[in-house]
């Protein structure tokens, strides 16, 4: 038994690291395998992930964290009973993916302009609670070529924008994702999307 | 709320014996390294010792080596100091801090006194 | 002898800023983070920073920590007389598997 993509782990920077790996050939990633991780601190203690399987010969593992600073770093031992296959570190804040923000709300009471409302995915106390900024997808599901992006670089969870600016009469779907620029992070995963139907009224058109 | 209280101090001769105590209450207790730091009358803090949350690591200040020993009963929620052979300057108020990272959560202090 | 130096006093005015630094000594291994602190007058000690620079729930934001190599510092924005206080600055000696503590720093709100 061999690792043939050693594992590579991201971090929500709150409470869970995500460890993937393949191995060589079909694995059964829970009852063959181990993964011991343990924050490089003199009172630490190491802690075991059991794998799932992710595809035949992949694995993750979801590492459980108290919280997380800059300064972290983990070893990782990932063992197949006695033997031990690969031995690395992993620095979570090196490493970040946020969380995916939630509660997506579209307001469209507001007078001709939609209000996008989202929840920021962390706590006040975590420090990318003030720095995430933010990608709003919005998309016709009636026409794949109606598809937008807008950049919300500000750190406020919302979005206005003209009701206007999309066709009326028709349905539209919305999504939100974070990053933090701090930490050089990825993406976070899309939020769940929401739908509304886009009405507005027409003005007058003027001859 | 994390709580932390210590008992067990008193005055004790030259030579003899105390067993520190501390209680545990509002975390899980055997999740958590802790540890032990003494303050003498009028002075600056010492870190005394320290265990793991399993308790199979343990950690002493050179001045209290081979002399005090550390040990945890996680179902009790307590974590224990015993000391011997004391001295006179082992004379403080004695605090039992739970560790995360740093010492995130002291207790008041039980104060020993080393006198004859 | 600490390995950990602390001025032994400082002081200031309401609303002042005032830092008190904390060195290691030239053979202090540069490897844990600095932690910080408060003792009020007659009380056990309070976390007041860790990890370098982080502050625990509850501390006010006037309280920040920096940290360069073997050394690091404690800033104390907008002083009031509630900071009156002892801070000691401590680390983790992985070299020595121990922790230590600087000898502490009596802070006084003047006027």
């Known amino acids: 038994m061999k690792v043939l993509q050693e594992p590579t782990c991201v971090s929500d920077y709150m409470s869970i690291s995500t460890c993937e790996w393949k191995m060589n050939g079909p694995t059964n990633c829970s009852t063959e395998l181990r993964l011991l991780y343990q924050l490089v601190f003199l009172l630490s203690e190491a802690h075991t992930c059991i794998p799932e399987n992710n595809g035949g010969a992949g694995c993750v593992c979801h590492l459980l964290m108290d919280d997380v600073v800059s300064a972290d770093n983990y070893t990782l031992d990932l063992w197949a009973g006695q033997q031990l296959l690969w031995k690395g570190s992993f620095k979570p804040s090196e490493h970040v993916k946020p969380r995916a923000p939630g509660n997506l709300t579209v307001h469209t009471n507001v007078s001709d302009t939609l209000l996008l409302t989202w929840s920021n995915p962390y706590p006040p106390d975590n420090y990318l609670y003030n720095h995430l900024t933010y990608a709003v997808n919005i998309w016709s599901e009636n026409d794949p070529a109606d598809f937008r992006i807008y950049n919300v670089t500000y750190l406020e969870p919302s979005l206005r924008i003209a009701a206007s600016t999309l066709k009326s009469g028709i349905s539209y779907r919305a999504r939100v994702r974070a990053w933090a620029q701090c930490y050089n992070t990825t993406w976070s995963e899309w939020s769940p999307s929401t739908k509304w139907h886009n009405s507005y009224r027409e003005p007058f058109e003027q001859h | 709320e994390v709580q932390l209280l210590e008992s067990g101090g008193g005055l004790v001769q030259p030579g003899g014996s105390l067993r520190l105590s501390c209680a545990a209450s509002?975390?899980?207790?055997?999740?958590?390294?802790m540890a032990w730091v003494r303050q003498a009358p009028g002075k600056g803090l010492e870190w005394v010792s320290a265990?793991?949350?399993?308790?199979?690591?343990?950690y002493y200040a050179d001045s209290v080596k081979g002399r005090f020993t550390i040990s945890r009963d996680n179902s009790k929620n307590t974590l224990y100091l015993q000391m011997n052979s004391l001295r006179a300057e082992d004379t403080a108020v004695y605090y039992c801090?739970?560790?995360?990272?740093?010492?995130?959560?002291w207790g008041q202090g039980t104060l020993v006194t080393v006198s004859s | 002898q600490s390995v950990l130096t602390q001025p032994p006093s400082a002081s200031g005015t309401p609303g002042q800023r005032v830092t008190i630094s904390c060195s290691g000594s030239?053979?202090?291994?540069?490897?844990?983070?600095f932690n910080w602190y408060q003792q009020l007058p007659g009380t056990a000690p309070k976390l007041l920073i860790y990890?370098?620079?982080h502050r625990p729930s509850g501390v006010p934001d006037r309280f920040s920590g920096s940290k360069s190599g073997t050394s690091a510092s404690l800033a104390i924005s907008g002083l009031r007389s509630e900071d009156e206080a002892d801070y000691y600055c401590?680390?983790?000696?992985?070299?020595?598997?121990?922790?230590?503590l600087g000898g502490g720093t009596k802070l006084t709100v003047l006027g």
């Open positions: 801090a739970r560790v995360h990272r740093a010492f995130d959560y």
């Open positions: 509002g975390f899980t207790f055997s999740r958590h390294a």
């Open positions: 265990i793991t949350a399993s308790g199979r690591s343990i």
């Open positions: 030239p053979l202090f291994p540069d490897s844990g983070s």
């Open positions: 990890a370098d620079s």
């Open positions: 401590g680390t983790w000696d992985y070299s020595l598997n121990r922790y230590v």
